[in-house]
């Protein structure tokens, strides 16, 4: 069952998701100046079964000008640098790691992929958050959020963290040190 | 809470054009497609086409190009949907919808008549 | 364009029952099918998507199944709130398309 909106935002922070959930589709976007082909999914879908998922439907993207030509993707991961801070880079080297029964791992990138992936989580999928570079974590509690269905809506749990620039106070009173991410948190995709 | 919405109702004369909005509200606007439908009574549900407010890309289905004009004000969230050269043909319930069909507007009734 | 066939206009049932209805793509969709329902005077809702996956909120006796040309809403346990028309749409390939729709009729 898809959510029926988007994670909770935080200031100065990025979302990702360790694996995602059957069911959850990752919308196919372009950068500027190319177009989702004419036909095809307009997204990839995490299916399969409890042994095995993977992510049906390919994105593929294609020259605006040249509205006739359609170009057969090959994955280039080069095409990711635009994407990702090498922080993030070896975060996933660490989901790649990851295989959970009913989850997909991160698929790779498309040619001429947009610069923000666009994902339709369903209930149940957590997401962990990451203050973004030059910003520190605060902690209350887990900088994570979860999709959870009550009384037939859906609805994301707020994530405990606040991310503060590194010339503030970096901790709340009596705290410890916070960490800038939770221990061992193998991120994904960037999604915000 | 995702809502679309378009106001209930246009009494257009023929010839003429008419524009209709779709307010979106509850989700990043620039960050999916809004399509447009159009329903008439013994003609089914019919797909007009999509923009994406993000990249300003759209697509049109053939049969109403020259029609239709799709556009999108990312500033205030809201798609708009230009049918021109209006005629009985036309009148008929419009629904915008986003996020891969999984939301629908109410629906906006255009009513073609002298 | 791909034509979406609900060869069915109409479907009787009791409430309790399980029915189905069917729509045939005119060529191959892959799973890119979703299903509507229609209840008088509302707009669409969402059901189906990617040919078996539910939407949130939609009750689980609503199923889906099929690909390639042949898809399938199976409803168990009918309920009198299910009265209405059900749309399949494709979206594999630009433009998109609808069946013609089937209206359910509960006896």
């Known amino acids: 069952e898809l959510c029926d909106d988007d994670p909770p935002k935080i200031t100065h922070a990025t979302f990702k998701a360790v694996a995602y959930k059957e069911g959850t589709m990752l919308n196919c976007e372009c950068k500027r100046g190319f177009r989702r082909i004419k036909s095809g999914s307009p997204y990839m879908l995490c299916t399969g079964n409890s042994s095995h998922s993977s992510w049906d439907n390919q994105c593929q993207c294609t020259s605006s000008a040249a509205r006739n030509t359609t170009k057969q993707v090959t994955p280039q991961p080069e095409e990711q640098k635009e994407r990702k801070t090498t922080e993030m880079q070896s975060q996933m080297q660490l989901a790649d790691q990851v295989s959970l029964p009913g989850h997909c791992r991160e698929p790779p990138p498309w040619e001429n992929e947009a610069t923000e992936r666009i994902y339709h989580f369903v209930v149940g999928q957590t997401v962990y958050y990451q203050c973004v570079q030059g910003y520190r974590a605060l902690h209350r509690g887990p900088a994570e959020s979860v999709c959870k269905m009550t009384h037939g809506k859906t609805r994301w749990t707020q994530p405990q963290l606040i991310c503060t620039g590194e010339t503030e106070p970096s901790q709340f009173p009596g705290e410890e040190e916070p960490q800038a991410s939770p221990d061992g948190l193998p991120e994904s995709e960037t999604s915000r | 809470q995702v809502q679309l919405q378009q106001p209930g109702a246009e009494l257009v004369r023929p010839g003429t054009s008419v524009k209709m909005s779709c307010k979106a509200a509850?989700?990043?606007?620039?960050?999916?497609?809004i399509g447009w439908v159009k329903q008439r009574p013994g003609h089914g549900l019919e797909w007009i086409g999509d923009?994406?407010?993000?990249?300003?890309?759209?697509n049109y289905n053939e049969k109403f190009k020259g029609k239709a004009t799709l556009t999108a004000d990312t500033s205030s969230s809201t798609a708009y949907m230009n049918l021109s050269s209006l005629t009985s043909e036309d009148s008929a319930i419009y629904y915008c919808?986003?996020?891969?069909?999984?939301?629908w507007g109410q629906g906006t009734l255009v009513t073609v008549s002298a | 364009d791909v034509v979406m066939t609900q060869t069915q206009k109409f479907t009787s049932t009791s409430v309790g029952d399980r029915v189905s209805v069917t729509c045939k793509a005119s060529?191959?969709?892959?799973?890119?099918v979703a299903w509507y329902q229609q209840k008088p005077g509302q707009s669409p809702k969402a059901l189906i998507y990617?040919?078996?996956y539910r939407y949130s909120g939609v009750p689980d006796r609503f199923t889906g199944s099929g690909s390639g040309t042949d898809f399938t809403l199976t409803i168990s346990n009918v309920q009198s709130e299910d009265l209405a028309e059900y749309f399949c749409?494709?979206?594999?390939?630009?433009?998109?398309?609808f069946g013609g729709g089937t209206k359910l009729e509960i006896k």
């Open positions: 919808t986003s996020r891969n069909f999984a939301y």
């Open positions: 509850g989700y990043t606007f620039t960050n999916y497609w």
């Open positions: 923009i994406h407010p993000g990249g300003d890309y759209s």
């Open positions: 060529q191959n969709v892959g799973t890119n």
């Open positions: 990617s040919a078996s």
């Open positions: 749409q494709q979206y594999n390939s630009y433009p998109y398309t």
